[in-house]
């Protein structure tokens, strides 16, 4: 059967800091999260079956003034979907998206979402992971911050 | 045959106000809009066939100063794609996206688009609908504001 | 076999100016770029097989103060995915997205990405192309600026 995964953020273990970090905590079997013929391990989505896959990610960032004091109003809110090959140790960004934002103190609430998607050849054993900047701003809802993949066709 | 739908906004009946509202007027059979083995009824896209579907939405907001003055320059421009189960009356958000925006009077034109997409298990009889904030700011073009679904695979 | 394409920007030949232009230089056979049972010619993605396709585009814009001064701080950063039919000479926009942005001199770096996607009936011979505003601001990375398509099902 065709492999797929839809992984939703597990917000119990989100790093702080503004630098780019890999998000390693995702749900794969609760709510909208699900996986079949792929493996989730050590924060990475592992391909078990060669093929062409459609990959996607939706990442939401938010800040409310009650959450704390932003260190800067000038933010880079970014997502990077990366592929790691274990056989030939290397990591490459497949897709990136995001925006620089000016989140001033004049507004009590700020929100921004990124969506990326694309069609990629994936080999068994390759790993997909998601990196973001400013992870402490992530929206922890399952409808907000997620990524996934589904196989569309075999490699000829 | 595999079900699909691509529904484009019917702008003749867009609600006013800035609160979150469900958009009920969509075209299903003109221009780019089309539907097969799914049903569009009462503003909702109804699933006729169990399966895993890729769902997507593209929502564009725009304002020109000739349209009148905005009630506030601080806007939350949001989309929510929801699933309603009739058997167990409940509604849940599958995907959300958007941004807070500062649309100042210094610029005569403002525009912003949201795209969301994800892979979900849908059962026959379940209904997909789209909610947005600030519906009066929606771009009424068929290439701008639309949502859709296509079945990728059966449920095992 | 099911047709697909994933085309990444060829930044050696990006037009200047702020007006809407068609992007004609894309890679189809290096890095993440690939094509099968579709044709890339004269800057357009040509459909060889009737069917329903999922089309997508990811477009990233960026500016660093070291690149020079922006002519205006108020920008319209837009993408348009268009379909051209040769038999009946006509061009229509399938999808659009983007945002107006205020990229002030107070920040040394600015970034913004757009993602659009949708499900469309395409006939053999039809051509897909991508237009953007402000092409000189495009991010030339293969993970940043790309578009693609994959066939999901036949036309009944």
């Amino acid at each position: 059967a065709q492999p797929f995964a839809h992984l939703t953020i597990n917000a119990t273990n989100i790093p702080t800091g503004s630098h780019k970090v890999s998000l390693s905590s995702w749900y794969h079997d609760r709510g909208w999260a699900k996986i079949s013929n792929m493996t989730f391990s050590n924060g990475k989505l592992i391909v078990n079956q060669d093929g062409f896959y459609y990959l996607y990610a939706n990442i939401c960032f938010r800040h409310h003034e009650t959450s704390g004091d932003l260190a800067t109003e000038y933010l880079q809110l970014m997502v990077y979907v990366t592929k790691t090959s274990i056989k030939i140790p290397s990591s490459h960004t497949l897709m990136k998206g995001g925006s620089t934002k000016y989140w001033s103190g004049n507004s009590e609430f700020h929100f921004y979402s990124i969506n990326v998607g694309g069609f990629f050849k994936l080999r068994s054993g390759e790993e997909i992971s998601v990196e973001v900047s400013n992870p402490s701003l992530l929206d922890p809802d399952q409808d907000a911050t997620y990524f996934g993949a589904f196989k569309v066709r075999d490699i000829d | 045959a595999q079900p699909f739908a691509h529904l484009t906004i019917n702008a003749t009946n867009i609600p006013t106000g800035s609160h979150k509202v469900s958009l009920s007027s969509w075209y299903h059979d003109r221009g780019w809009a089309k539907i097969s083995n799914m049903t569009f009824s009462n503003g909702k896209l109804i699933v006729n066939q169990d399966g895993f579907y890729y769902l997507y939405a593209n929502i564009c907001f725009r304002h020109h100063e000739t349209s009148g003055d905005l009630a506030t320059e601080y806007l939350q421009l949001m989309v929510y794609v929801t699933k309603t189960s009739i058997k167990i009356p409940s509604s849940h958000t599958l995907m959300k996206g958007g941004s807070t925006k500062y649309w100042s009077g210094n610029s005569e034109f403002h525009f912003y688009s949201i795209n969301v997409g994800g892979f979900f298990k849908l059962r026959s009889g379940e209904e997909i609908s789209v909610e947005v904030s600030n519906p009066s700011l929606l771009d009424p073009d068929q290439d701008a504001t639309y949502f859709g679904a296509f079945k990728v695979r059966d449920i095992d | 076999a099911q047709p697909f394409a994933h085309l990444t920007i060829n930044a050696t030949n990006i037009p200047t100016g702020s007006h809407k232009v068609s992007l004609s230089s894309w890679y189809h056979d290096r890095g993440w770029a690939k094509i099968s049972n579709m044709t890339f010619s004269n800057g357009k993605l040509i459909v060889n097989q009737d069917g329903f396709y999922y089309l997508y585009a990811n477009i990233c814009f960026r500016h660093h103060e070291t690149s020079g001064d922006l002519a205006t701080e108020y920008l319209q950063l837009m993408v348009y995915v268009t379909k051209t039919s040769i038999k009946i000479p006509s061009s229509h926009t399938l999808m659009k997205g983007g945002s107006t942005k205020y990229w002030s001199g107070n920040s040394e770096f600015h970034f913004y990405s757009i993602n659009v996607g949708g499900f469309f009936k395409l006939r053999s011979g039809e051509e897909i192309s991508v237009e953007v505003s402000n092409p000189s601001l495009l991010d030339p990375d293969q993970d940043a600026t790309y578009f693609g398509a994959f066939k999901v099902r036949d036309i009944d």
Epitope: T16, G17, S18, H19, S67, G68, D69, L70, A71, T72, E73, Y74, L75, Y102, S104, G105, N134, P135, S136, L137 | - | N106
Partner: nanobody
């Protein structure tokens, strides 16, 4: 390395005003947030106010909100604390501090600040 030097403290009657200054030297001043803290005799150092690098956002302890104003002049590499409607309980040594770490959120915990001035005494008499 960042050097911070405060000035502007003194003795003032309740209801009066003072303006503290903190002059910075060293690395690019405009790139990092700054904070004011105070320490009264026998008490732990407490957060008063902070400001982002651009000066676009300011944050205050509830006890000083509406009375104190933090600001900065990046051209002069200086941060200010305007203190109005002073009360006896505002008596303390006031210190400015620089927040260098690349965090999304500014801490109000003085231990997270990296560079400190020597402090300036503010005494409010009743």
């Amino acid at each position: 390395e960042v050097q911070l030097v405060e000035s502007g403290g003194g003795l003032v009657q309740a209801g009066g005003s003072l303006r503290l200054s903190c002059a910075a030297s060293g690395r690019t001043f405009r790139s990092y947030p700054m904070g004011w803290f105070r320490q009264a005799p026998g008490k732990e150092r407490e957060f008063v106010a902070s400001i982002t690098g651009s000066g676009g956002s300011t944050y205050y302890a509830d006890s000083v909100k509406g009375r104190f104003t933090i600001s900065r002049d990046n051209a002069k590499n200086t941060v200010y604390l305007q203190m109005n409607s002073l009360r006896p309980e505002d008596t303390a040594v006031y210190s400015c501090a620089a927040y260098i770490r690349p965090d999304t959120y500014l801490s109000r915990d003085y231990r997270k600040y990296d560079y400190w001035g020597q402090g300036t005494q503010v005494t409010v008499s009743s």
